[in-house]
């Protein structure tokens, strides 16, 4: 066994120079992929299909904005020192889609929108901006729309289950639907402080005829029109002593 | 065994130069993938299909905004040091979709929207901004819409189950639906402070005829129009001592 | 040392920065919404000694060092972050900054 | 140390920064919404000895060092973060910063 090991080593030694040169672009990419997952604290790449992405990706201005900002990649003021605590990704914006909520489900037997699940990693005082984006379907005639965002609360003695978060009135003309954003920073911060108070919200956008224009559960051809929360957070990494 | 080791080392030493060149782009990418998952504290890549993504991704301005910001990739305030306690990604924005809530389910037998689940890692004082985004369906005629966001609370003696978070009145014209965002920072912060108070919210957006325009549970073709919470947090990772 | 920039046709044997584009679409990472690809670049070339890899950006084949001493290795001396918009597999789309994803300069260290 | 920049055509053998684009779509990471790809770059080049890999931007073959001593290796000396928008698998889309994802500078260390 010793002689076999010796011969193996000799053969390996003879070809190290070549082996070095054979490293391909492919292996570099693979290493970077692994690094990305690690930096994002992901064990594996999320398993999501292109079809699912097409359905999920909000077809809304904030997404276009993020994508269009991709030409300037560099941080001109970064000194780029290689401290280990600057390894992981920092989150700046979180776009959260509504998820199912047992409480919302039980209110009156049919699914309601919306419940947003938050990670306990989000600290309420790090929230810079939080906006609920809703899509209002096209109207056929000019109309005034009353948008109402209600926060689900535990039923009160008088039966009250909701409390208003925000109301707004806007005019819509026939044509394409429009995206509307509503500031929900305070509500979100409260939810983060008191997660148990996050029971869900209800979104209503009624036209003058009482039709609800808000897309809460996208129908056919309405991929990407779900309501969602756009949360901007500030992330200031602390430095360790050397 | 000592002589075997010595011979192995010698042979390997002869071929280091070649071995160097054999590393491939593929392996770099793989390493980066692993690193990304690690930095995101993910054991594996999230298992999410493209179909799921298409359904989940809010079609709303915050998403477009985030995507369009991708030309500016650098962190101007980052010094880029690589300290070990800054290895993981920092979250800046969390977009949370509503999830199921036992409490919401139990109110009167049918699902209601919305319950947002939050991670205990989110600190209420780190929330910079929190917005509930809702999509208001298109209206056929100009109308005023009253948006109400109610917070679900534990039933009070008088039966009250909801308390208002925010109300707003807005005008809508016929055309496309719109996204509306509602500031829910305070509510979110309260939820984070007292998770047990997060029972869900109800969203109402009634037009002048009482029709609810808010998309709470997207119907066919309404993928991406779910309500969601957009939470921006400030993340200040602690440094480890060396 | 400002670092050398090389390309695939360079004959430079010293530690140098080479272009490398990571194309997420090419390997099916559809969960990354943006960018679809980015220029990562990489370092390659000769230094006196080779060290253990800390980051995958310095992709080394681990071998025993017959001399037993530590030598410098061609690694990134300046790196930049990229912003990324991606699904995190939890009903969320995240826009964040990933540090040290682009090699700006290489050097022996 | 400002580091060397090389590309695939460089003949530089010293520790150098090379371009490397990581394309998430290419390897099916659909959960990353944005970026779909980014420029990670990597360090590669010669240092006296070869050490363990830390970053893929410096792509080395790990081998035993016959001399038994640790030598410096071509690694990133300056790295930057990237922002990423991704699903986290928990009904959330996260936008955040991932540090040290782009190699700005490589060096032997």
């Amino acid at each position: 066994e010793n002689s076999e090991q010796k011969e193996n080593v000799e053969k390996e030694g003879l070809c190290n120079a070549c082996t070095w040169r054979q490293n391909t672009k492919s292996s570099r990419i693979e290493a970077i992929k692994i690094q990305i997952l690690s930096k994002l604290r992901l064990e594996t790449a999320p398993n999501i299909s292109k079809d699912a992405i097409r359905q999920l990706l909000p077809k809304a201005p904030p997404l276009r904005e993020l994508i269009d900002q991709y030409d300037v990649q560099r941080d001109d003021s970064s000194d780029g020192s290689l401290e280990d605590d600057d390894y992981h990704a920092t989150t700046e914006t979180i776009i959260t889609m509504p998820t199912e909520s047992d409480f919302l489900m039980q209110v009156d037997g049919k699914p309601k929108c919306c419940f947003f699940k938050f990670s306990s990693k989000i600290q309420y005082n790090k929230v810079v901006k939080a906006q609920l984006w809703i899509y209002l379907r096209p109207v056929e005639t000019p109309t005034t729309v009353f948008v109402q965002i209600l926060r689900l609360i535990k039923p009160m003695k008088d039966g009250t289950r909701y409390t208003g978060i925000r109301s707004l009135k806007l005019d819509m003309n026939p044509g394409t639907g429009i995206w509307q954003s509503i500031d929900v920073k305070t509500v979100l911060q409260n939810w983060l402080k008191q997660p148990e108070s996050n029971l869900g919200i209800e979104i209503k956008a009624l036209d003058e005829n009482g039709h609800d224009l808000a897309v809460t559960f996208p129908g056919p051809g309405e991929d990407g029109l779900n309501p969602f929360l756009e949360v901007k957070v500030t992330d200031t990494p602390k430095r360790s002593r050397r | 065994e000592n002589s075997e080791q010595k011979e192995n080392v010698e042979k390997e030493g002869l071929c280091n130069a070649c071995t160097w060149r054999q590393n491939t782009k593929s392996s770099r990418i793989e390493a980066i993938k692993i690193q990304i998952l690690s930095k995101l504290r993910l054991e594996t890549a999230p298992n999410i299909s493209k179909d799921a993504i298409r359904q989940l991704l809010p079609k709303a301005p915050p998403l477009r905004e985030l995507i369009d910001q991708y030309d500016v990739q650098r962190d101007d305030s980052s010094d880029g040091s690589l300290e070990d306690d800054d290895y993981h990604a920092t979250t800046e924005t969390i977009i949370t979709m509503p999830t199921e809530s036992d409490f919401l389910m139990q109110v009167d037998g049918k699902p209601k929207c919305c319950f947002f689940k939050f991670s205990s890692k989110i600190q209420y004082n780190k929330v910079v901004k929190a917005q509930l985004w809702i999509y208001l369906r298109p209206v056929e005629t100009p109308t005023t819409v009253f948006v109400q966001i109610l917070r679900l609370i534990k039933p009070m003696k008088d039966g009250t189950r909801y308390t208002g978070i925010r109300s707003l009145k807005l005008d809508m014209n016929p055309g496309t639906g719109i996204w509306q965002s509602i500031d829910v920072k305070t509510v979110l912060q309260n939820w984070l402070k007292q998770p047990e108070s997060n029972l869900g919210i109800e969203i109402k957006a009634l037009d002048e005829n009482g029709h609810d325009l808010a998309v709470t549970f997207p119907g066919p073709g309404e993928d991406g129009l779910n309500p969601f919470l957009e939470v921006k947090v400030t993340d200040t990772p602690k440094r480890s001592r060396r | 040392d400002f670092g050398l920039d090389c390309d695939e046709h360079s004959t430079e044997s010293r530690c140098c920065r080479y272009p490398l584009t990571v194309d997420f679409e090419a390997f099916g990472w559809d969960w990354i919404i943006a960018p679809k690809r980015y220029k990562a670049n990489y370092c390659s070339g000769e230094c006196e000694f080779v060290f253990l890899q800390k980051y995958p950006h310095t992709h080394l084949v681990h071998q025993a060092n017959p001399r037993g001493s530590a030598g410098p290795c061609c690694t990134p001396t300046k790196m930049s972050p990229i912003n990324m918009l991606y699904f995190n597999g939890k009903e969320q789309i995240i826009y964040g900054k990933i540090p040290a994803m682009v090699v700006d300069r290489c050097g022996c260290s | 140390d400002f580091g060397l920049d090389c590309d695939e055509h460089s003949t530089e053998s010293r520790c150098c920064r090379y371009p490397l684009t990581v394309d998430f779509e290419a390897f099916g990471w659909d959960w990353i919404i944005a970026p779909k790809r980014y420029k990670a770059n990597y360090c590669s080049g010669e240092c006296e000895f070869v050490f363990l890999q830390k970053y893929p931007h410096t792509h080395l073959v790990h081998q035993a060092n016959p001399r038994g001593s640790a030598g410096p290796c071509c690694t990133p000396t300056k790295m930057s973060p990237i922002n990423m928008l991704y699903f986290n698998g928990k009904e959330q889309i996260i936008y955040g910063k991932i540090p040290a994802m782009v190699v700005d500078r490589c060096g032997c260390s």
Epitope: R54, K59, I67, Q69, Q180, S181 | N173, T176, W179 | - | -
Partner: antibody
């Protein structure tokens, strides 16, 4: 009524600066992207730039260094400023709601204003 | 720079015929579907016909349809009407704040 209307000088001398205003009604500029597109006489459409709902600006490569886009949400106005005008910049300038090519951007346009660059 | 090429430059057909207009981009549009089609008649601003490559805009007749993905796209008018005489433009988005129009295809009715 949702409308967009461009206004500004009809005639500009070479090397001078062009300032055009897009006045909108029924549109909340804090939620809506506004694009500028131009069309030289007898020619095709040419993208000029965008000011996003969030205030970010994106410009055609040929316009960088010459183009400034701003907005005053309270006045419902978006302003385009282009320096060092040249006769080749003679065109009808349009403002449009949204971003053409993204979602239903470009679903609503102003009537356009013809700007002639001549000495 | 990105180049969007439309073909043919001019299309002359009779009423009731099927019109097929092509748009080819020098690089893939973002998410393979950031592409819209516009119709423009003399003296008028453009009118949105199709977005997301294949989604019919509000109020547009169903004889118009769009298809394609990535770099190659097609606008089809199933049965030409006299009022369809116009110039048609494709517009693509590429991320990074980059957008471009094709040079246009003029459709004439014989």
């Amino acid at each position: 009524q949702v409308t967009l209307k461009e206004s500004g000088p009809v005639l500009v001398k070479p090397t001078e600066t062009l300032t055009l205003t897009c006045t909108v009604s029924g549109i909340d500029l804090s939620h809506t992207d506004i694009s500028w597109v131009r069309q030289a006489p007898g020619k095709g459409l040419e993208w000029v730039g965008i000011i996003s709902y969030a205030g970010s600006k994106y410009k055609a490569s040929w316009a960088k260094g010459r183009l400034t886009i701003s907005k005053d949400t309270s006045k419902n106005q978006v302003v385009l400023t282009m320096t060092n005008m040249d006769p080749v910049d003679t065109a009808t300038y349009y403002c449009a709601r949204g971003v053409p090519a993204y979602s239903h951007g470009g679903d609503l346009w102003g009537q356009g204003t013809l700007v002639t660059v001549s000495s | 720079d990105i180049v969007m090429t439309q073909s043919p430059a001019t299309l002359s057909l009779s009423p009731g015929e099927r019109a097929t207009l092509s748009c080819t981009s020098s690089q893939s549009v973002y998410h393979a579907n950031w592409l819209s089609w516009f119709q423009q008649k003399p003296g008028q601003p453009p009118k949105l016909l199709i977005y997301w490559a294949s989604t019919l805009a509000y109020g547009v007749p169903s004889r118009f349809s769009g298809s394609g993905s990535g770099t190659d796209f097609t606008l089809t008018i199933s049965s030409l009407q006299p009022e369809d005489a116009a110039t048609y433009y494709c517009a693509g988005g590429y991320g990074g704040g980059r957008y471009a129009f094709g040079q246009g295809t003029k459709v004439e009715i014989k």
